[in-house]
C-alpha cells in the first residue's frame, strides 16, 4: 500500500515531505511566492492529493505557474512604459505610468512605478492597487509670453497659444422674443470647467432679477485665435451654468460664475487651464502687472453707446491682450466716488489700468481672466475677471477697469467643481 515517491513541482513544494507515503497519507502542494498552483487550467493557492488503497496517488502533481498581472489598466491622459524586457507582466515585473506632459501632471508627484505583486495585482508603494491621477497642468502656456510691453484698448494681437486658457462664451438666448445674442470671455480651470463673470451668464432681462441663461443657450470655444475661423477651435456646450448666489446686478458685487462643459476638452498647446490663486482676501498687490486678453473693442475712439448700438460689429477678429497694473484700492474707490451714478468698488473687486488712460479692457472682454505671473510657482494665476468700468468710453483718463477679486472665491469655486482643494493641489498657486 505504499505510494510512489513524489517530486515537488518546479517553483513549488509538497508538505509534509516524507521518505515514504502510505494509504491515507495526504500531501499539500503549494508554490513559491509569485507562483500559483495550476491544475487542469485552473489556478489555485494549494492542491491536496491522497495516497489511495491501491498504492496510487489520487491526482497527478500540479504545476506551478508564475503569477501574471496581465495588461495594466489604462490611465486617462497618461502613458504606460514597461521596465521589464519583452513587456513582461509577470511577478516582479515593473511598469511606469506617466502623464501626458506638459499638459498633465501626476497628482502628489507620485513615482508612477507599479510592481506585479504575488497576488497578481499591479501595486504602487503609496497608492496600492489604485491608479494614479493625471491632473491638467495649469498656468504654463506652451508659448512663453513675450516681455511685457507697456500698453483690447491699446492692446496688441496675441499669438496662438499665448493664452491657452482663454475661452469665448457665446450666449444665444432663443427663449427671448426676439432672440438675444451676446458674448463674453472666460478662463479654463480644468478640462471641464470655465470661470467667467456672472453678468455674462445672466439672462438679459428688462428687470433686475438675476436668472442664469439656460445651459442650452451657451456655447464655449477654446483654442480660438481668430473669431472668423473657428475651424481649429474646440467648441463645447454647457452641462451646467452656475452664477454666484449673491451676484448683485445693482453693483456687480460677486460677479463670478462657472460653466461646466458637457464633455472634458482635450488639452494641448492651445488649450490649457490657468491656475487658481490661494484664498487671499487682500487680492493682488497694488502696482503688480497683469495681462488680460479678449476679443472686445480695440478701437479707443468708439464710444460705449456706439458699441451697444452696433452689436458685434466692433469686435476684434484676433485675440488682443493688454498689460495693466493693479491700482491701489483707495485710489480706485476715490476715482469712482467722484463720478455721478452709483459706482461702489467693494472688497470683492480690484481695479487695474493707467491714470492717463489709453489701455483698458472693454465691452466684450467681460469675464476674461486678469492673470499675474507667480514667480514662486512659475505659473500664471487668474487673479481677476473683467467685470465693469465707468460711464465714459473704454480707456478714458482716470477710469480704471474693475475686476472680480478671484482670490475671495477660491473655496466657492472648488465647492462648485466638487473637488476638495487638497485633492487638486497642483491647480492651486504654490
Amino acid at each position: 500500500n505504499e505510494c510512489p515517491e513524489l517530486q515537488p513541482p518546479v517553483h513549488g513544494k509538497i508538505e509534509p515531505s516524507q521518505a515514504k507515503y502510505f494509504f491515507k497519507d495526504q500531501v499539500l502542494v503549494s508554490c513559491d511566492t509569485g507562483y500559483k498552483v495550476l491544475k487542469d487550467n485552473v489556478e489555485m493557492d494549494t492542491f491536496q492529493i491522497e495516497c489511495l488503497k491501491d498504492g496510487t496517488w489520487s491526482n497527478k502533481i500540479p504545476t506551478c505557474k508564475i503569477v501574471d498581472c496581465r495588461a495594466p489598466g489604462e490611465l486617462e491622459h497618461g502613458l504606460i512604459t514597461f521596465s521589464t524586457r519583452n513587456n513582461l507582466t509577470t511577478y516582479k515585473s515593473e511598469i511606469k505610468y506617466s502623464c501626458q506632459e506638459p499638459y498633465y501632471k501626476m497628482l502628489n508627484n507620485n513615482t508612477g512605478i507599479y510592481t506585479c505583486s504575488a497576488q497578481g495585482v499591479w501595486m504602487n508603494k503609496v497608492l496600492g492597487r489604485s491608479l494614479p491621477t493625471c491632473l491638467p497642468e495649469c498656468g504654463q502656456p506652451s508659448r512663453s509670453l513675450p516681455s511685457l510691453v507697456k500698453r483690447i484698448i491699446g492692446g496688441r494681437n496675441a499669438e496662438p497659444g499665448l493664452f491657452p486658457w482663454q475661452a469665448l462664451i457665446v450666449v444665444e438666448d432663443t427663449s427671448r422674443v426676439p432672440n438675444d445674442k451676446w458674448f463674453g470671455s472666460g478662463a479654463l480651470l480644468s478640462a471641464s470647467w470655465i470661470l467667467t463673470a456672472a453678468h455674462v451668464l445672466r439672462s438679459q432681462r428688462r428687470d433686475t432679477t438675476v436668472i442664469p441663461v439656460s445651459k442650452e443657450h451657451v456655447t464655449v470655444y477654446l483654442g480660438l485665435h481668430d473669431v472668423r475661423d473657428k475651424s481649429g477651435a474646440v467648441n463645447s456646450s454647457a452641462a451646467r451654468v452656475v452664477l454666484h448666489p449673491d451676484f448683485n446686478i445693482q453693483n456687480y458685487n460677486h460677479d463670478i460664475a462657472l460653466v461646466q462643459l458637457q464633455e472634458p476638452v482635450p488639452l494641448g498647446p492651445h488649450v490649457m487651464p490657468v491656475c487658481l490663486p490661494r484664498l487671499e482676501p487682500e487680492g493682488p498687490a497694488p502696482h503688480m502687472l497683469g495681462l488680460v486678453a479678449g476679443w472686445g473693442i480695440s478701437n479707443p475712439n468708439v464710444t460705449v453707446d456706439e458699441i451697444i448700438s452696433s452689436g458685434t460689429r466692433t469686435l476684434s477678429d484676433v485675440l488682443q491682450y493688454v498689460k495693466l497694473p493693479v491700482v491701489p484700492h483707495a485710489e480706485c474707490k476715490t476715482s469712482y466716488e467722484s463720478r455721478s451714478g452709483n459706482y461702489s468698488v467693494t472688497e470683492n473687486m480690484f481695479c487695474a489700468g493707467y491714470y492717463e488712460g489709453g489701455k483698458d479692457t472693454c465691452l466684450g472682454d467681460s469675464g476674461g481672466a486678469f492673470v499675474i505671473f507667480d514667480d514662486l510657482s512659475q505659473r500664471w494665476v487668474v487673479q481677476g475677471l473683467v467685470s465693469w468700468g465707468g460711464p465714459e468710453e473704454c480707456g478714458s483718463k482716470q477710469v480704471y477697469g474693475v475686476y472680480t477679486k478671484v482670490s475671495n472665491y477660491v473655496d466657492w469655486v472648488w465647492e462648485q467643481m466638487g473637488l476638495p482643494q487638497s485633492v487638486v493641489e497642483p491647480q492651486v498657486e504654490r
Partner: antibody, heavy 114, light 112 residues
C-alpha cells in the same frame, strides 16, 4: 404664435377662494416668468407677483403675499393664481403676462358677491 | 418701496399733435453697471389688455410705431407721441422694474 389664454369669469362668495389659470403656448414656457396684474374697475394696474416656471421661484408684491399663491404646471404649460379669503376689494380683472410683458392674456373677471 | 408718479392724469389733444407725458420715480432707476434705466411704458386701450410700448426707458418694443419715443434717465422719464392718431386713445402707464415692479397711476389720453 405666442398666446396666453386665461380661464373664464368667476363669481365667488366672500371668504371663499378661487383659482385662475393662464395657459401659455408658442414659446419656451420654462424660460420666461409669468406675471400677474390686478385692475379694479376704472382703476390702474397693480402688480401682484411673478413665478419662474423653470424652478418655481416666486416673488410677490408685499400687499399680496397673504392674498395670492402662484403655481405652475410645466407639463401643461399653465400658470395658476389662487386668491384666498375673498372680499369685495378683490373684485377685479386679473391679467397674466409673459416674455417680460411682451404678451398678455385677455384677463379674467373675478366678481366677489354674496 | 419705489413710488411712481405720472402727470398729467389726463390730457386731450387733436389728431396730428405732439404729446408728452411724464413719469417720476421716488428713486433712481438707473443701474450704472448695465447703463440701463429699468422703466417701461404701457398702453391700455378701453376694454383691452395692456400692451408694452417701451422698455429700458427708451427701447421700443418690436412692432411699436416709431411715433412713440421714450426718454429720460434716473428719476425723470417722458413718453412722447410725435403725431397722435385716433387709435392712440388709451391710458398710458409707466412701470419701474428696478426693484420688483410698481406701476404709475396712468395718464389718460383723449382725442379732441
Amino acid at each position: 404664435q405666442v398666446q396666453l389664454k386665461q380661464s373664464g369669469p368667476e363669481l365667488v362668495k366672500p371668504g371663499a377662494s378661487v383659482k385662475l389659470s393662464c395657459k401659455a403656448s408658442g414659446y419656451t414656457f420654462t424660460s420666461n416668468d409669468i406675471n400677474w396684474v390686478k385692475q379694479r374697475p376704472g382703476q390702474g394696474l397693480e402688480w401682484i407677483g411673478w413665478i419662474y416656471p423653470r424652478d418655481g421661484t416666486t416673488k410677490y408684491n408685499e400687499e399680496f403675499t397673504d392674498k395670492a399663491t402662484l403655481t405652475v404646471d410645466v407639463s401643461s404649460s399653465t400658470a395658476f393664481m389662487e386668491l384666498h379669503s375673498l372680499t369685495s376689494e378683490d373684485s377685479a380683472v386679473y391679467f397674466c403676462s409673459s416674455v417680460e410683458d411682451s404678451y398678455w392674456g385677455q384677463g379674467t373677471l373675478v366678481t366677489v358677491s354674496s | 418701496d419705489i413710488v411712481m408718479t405720472q402727470s398729467p392724469s389726463s390730457l386731450a389733444v387733436s389728431a396730428g399733435e405732439k404729446v408728452t407725458m411724464s413719469c417720476k420715480s421716488s428713486q433712481s432707476l438707473l443701474i450704472s453697471r448695465t447703463r440701463k434705466n429699468y422703466l417701461s411704458w404701457y398702453q391700455q386701450k378701453p376694454g383691452q389688455s395692456p400692451k408694452l410700448l417701451i422698455y429700458w426707458a427708451s427701447t421700443r418694443e418690436s412692432g411699436v410705431p416709431d411715433r412713440f419715443t421714450g426718454s429720460g434717465s434716473g428719476t425723470d422719464f417722458t413718453l412722447t407721441i410725435s403725431s397722435v392718431q385716433a387709435e392712440d386713445l388709451a391710458v398710458y402707464y409707466c412701470k419701474q422694474s428696478y426693484n420688483l415692479y410698481t406701476f404709475g397711476g396712468g395718464t389718460k389720453l383723449e382725442i379732441k
